[in-house]
């Protein structure tokens, strides 16, 4: 694979990974498909410190991260551990709750307005981040 | 110059392959997703196939999932459309082009090659 | 997969005349709306994304307005070089999908 050394044009560093700011929205899965033909993912948060780094960049707006449950547990899009890894849910969430009444439940994650995490339904366009890290040879991910 | 050049249309049966070629040149081909996009004679433009900088995400129309498969190889600044079993319904003009990027997250085709024609028939 | 739908099909104005094309989405697509022209024997050419924002080089007199599910390409003036068949897509849902296309013809 190739290896990136510095991050694109529009692309912010920080802690050798390089993030780029949505400014408008998609549901999740079309910004899981924007990042990943930008050979990124949609944000994985692995520590508080990258939380606050994220947070300051996004603002008090509904943005979408690399976490979902569409196939049962949860995941983290780069295949970080959930269950061990970093999270920030908001009180009594995630809810898989169904009473939006657009079918289904809420398999999604996003950075609320306080930067604390929602679970919500995936289809909602909110703006996202995607991440890519520096110096590190690109992976060959599955075939979407 | 910036510009895309492809190569490799042709005529061939109902169920044959084929494979289509793009070179790419005066940009820096690996830091952009590519994709293809047809007309058939006479018809409007379809989404084909896109692939990322590095050709680790590929992507395809439905119409075309599991017989045409889009790779590149950065080395040579060239894009491919491999076509299997290709039908009477893929008869078109294949362009190759580059997908440019917004600020606010969109992707468009920004930079077109003048386009190889594929027959499909007996 | 989202529909996009021109209108009208054929456009038959005169060199000089204003042309209004529009462009409507099945579901809203944001802002995530492209146009192109393509003349005869020629491959498209990006003329506004974002639904209003001018690719390189394209000259003034074509402006893009919309959001949502309605759009609209305007020729201020139409130059005898822009007579051609112009789309619209979009970017907003995979697949990628464009308009069947309005011909802009001489009257």
């Known amino acids: 694979g190739s290896e990136r050394t510095c991050c694109p044009v529009n692309w912010v560093e920080h802690e050798r990974s390089c993030y780029w700011f949505s400014r408008s929205g998609k549901a999740w899965a079309d910004a899981d498909n924007y990042c990943r033909l930008e050979d990124a993912h949609l944000v994985v948060v692995t520590s508080w410190e990258e939380q606050k780094f994220v947070q300051h960049h996004i603002g008090p707006v509904n943005t979408w991260m690399g976490l979902h449950d569409q196939n049962g547990p949860w995941k983290w899009v780069d295949g970080t551990d959930y269950e061990t890894g970093f999270k920030n849910w908001r009180p009594e969430q995630p809810d898989d709750w169904y009473g939006h009444g657009l079918g289904g439940g809420e398999d999604c994650a996003h950075f609320t307005d306080d930067g604390r995490w929602n679970d919500d339904v995936c289809q909602r366009p909110y703006r996202w981040v995607c991440e890519t890290e520096l110096d590190k040879a690109s992976q060959e991910p599955p075939l979407l | 110059e910036v510009q895309l050049l492809e190569s490799g249309g042709g005529l061939v049966q109902p169920g044959g392959s084929l494979r289509l070629s793009c070179a790419a040149s005066g940009f820096t081909f690996s830091s952009y997703a590519m994709s293809w996009v047809r007309q058939a004679p006479g018809k409007g433009l379809e989404w084909v196939s896109a692939i990322s900088g590095s050709g680790g995400s590929t992507y395809y129309a439905d119409s075309v999932k599991g017989r045409f498969t889009i790779s590149r190889d950065n080395s040579k600044n060239t894009l491919y459309l491999q076509m299997n079993s290709l039908r009477a319904e893929d008869t078109a003009v294949y362009y190759c082009?580059?997908?440019?990027?917004?600020?606010?997250?969109?992707?468009?085709?920004?930079?077109w090659g003048r386009g190889t024609l594929v027959t499909v028939s007996s | 997969e989202i529909v996009l739908t021109q209108s009208p099909a054929t456009l038959s104005l005169s060199p000089g005349e204003r042309a209004t094309l529009s462009c409507r989405a099945s579901q809203s697509v944001s802002s995530y709306l492209a146009w192109y022209q393509q003349k005869p024997g020629q491959a498209p050419r990006l003329l506004i994304y974002d639904a209003s924002k001018r690719a390189t080089g394209i000259p003034a007199r074509f402006s893009g307005s919309g959001s949502g599910t309605d759009f609209t390409l305007t020729i201020s003036s139409l130059e005898p070089e822009d007579f051609a068949v112009y789309y619209c897509q979009q970017d907003s849902n995979h697949p990628l999908t464009f308009g069947g296309g309005t011909k802009v013809e001489i009257k």
């Open positions: 082009a580059k997908l440019g990027t917004t600020v606010s997250g969109g992707h468009y085709f920004d930079l």
